[in-house]
């Protein structure tokens, strides 16, 4: 009789352990669901607010036609500047026209004044040709005014209303560019 009671007690204890395990799993699952719910709500809120604002450019970016521009507040070398832009889903500024150049230099005058800003222009070491980072050549009116005498790699930057060249390892501000979001309306 005592053995029977002891066996029943052990079975009950085993059941209790299983139930505790199930409860623990359920709590974990519930926590995971709550976390996912929170994430989904945040995502929905972001989507709705961005749809409501229908802003073609992110906060702190400037819009001009189909482009958004970000003027950095930190200095970095050219290659690090490129990395910083890529992290934002953008590339270093690529100036396609005199109109775009005028907009950029005008905006810089308002924001910061006469500093140096890296753009996505670099000189091919083999040919000495200037190329934008997508591989295209700048239009004749948008070539850096001075040839840098650096033995190192040479990159382009904007200062005041000029396009100039410098050793890519010098520290400057930089400008990123991405396409503006098109309104679906």
């Amino acid at each position: 009789k005592l053995l029977q009671v002891s066996t029943i007690a052990m079975q009950q204890q085993e059941k209790l352990i299983q139930q505790e395990r199930a409860l623990l799993n359920f709590t974990e699952w519930k926590r995971s669901c709550a976390l996912q719910m929170k994430y989904c709500q945040a995502f929905m809120q972001n989507s709705l607010s961005s749809a409501h604002n229908s802003s073609p450019c992110p906060n702190n970016w400037i819009q001009n036609r189909e482009s958004c521009y970000y003027v950095s507040e930190i200095w970095s070398i050219w290659h690090t500047s490129q990395e910083n832009c890529l992290k934002e889903g953008s590339t270093l500024l690529q100036i396609e026209s005199k109109e775009e150049m005028d907009f950029i230099t005008g905006s810089l005058r308002k924001i910061k004044g006469s500093y140096d800003y890296w753009v996505g222009l670099s000189q091919d070491g083999h040919s000495g040709r200037w190329l934008w980072q997508d591989g295209s050549s700048p239009s004749p009116g948008l070539l850096p005014a001075e040839r840098s005498q650096s033995a190192n790699q040479v990159c382009g930057y904007v200062k005041s209303n000029s396009l100039l060249s410098s050793n890519c390892s010098t520290w400057k501000y930089f400008i990123c560019e991405k396409y503006a979001l098109r309104s679906s309306v």
């Epitope: 889903g89 953008s90 590339t91 560019e177 991405k178």
Partner: nanobody, 121 residues
């Protein structure tokens, strides 16, 4: 777990071509840019080519006109077509994603394990 899986490396003669491919095997909240970097022995890792989520492209100066990057958002892959290969292109090529992880809020760099490209006769 593996997040970025490269394929397509190997030995090729100067002037030859190779195509590298990279597949993303993990979910991200968003991928801002994907691309390829390379590292030759004794040298720093350098950008070869990158493409942003908006389709903007950046190439390393030394590969312009020879390499072409493309991205398939539906398959979450990024390819690098390498033509007119030179001995100085010899390096380990790494796939990279600049992405915001699920439940994250900041962009992080994710790297593949690398694939060797050797250009030699």
């Amino acid at each position: 777990q593996v997040q970025l899986q490269e394929s397509g490396g190997g030995l090729v003669q100067p002037g030859g071509s190779l195509r590298l491919s990279c597949a993303v095997s993990r979910n991200f909240f968003s991928i801002n840019a994907m691309g390829w970097y390379r590292q030759a022995p004794g040298k720093q890792r350098e950008l070869v080519a990158a493409i942003t989520n908006g389709g903007r492209i950046a190439y390393g100066t030394s590969v312009m006109g020879r390499f072409t990057i493309s991205r398939d958002d539906a398959k979450n892959t990024v390819d690098l077509q390498m033509n007119s290969l030179r001995p100085e292109d010899t390096a380990v090529y790494y796939c990279n994603a600049k992405a915001i992880p699920v439940y994250g809020s900041t962009v992080e760099d994710y790297w593949g394990q690398g694939t060797q490209v050797t250009v030699s006769s």
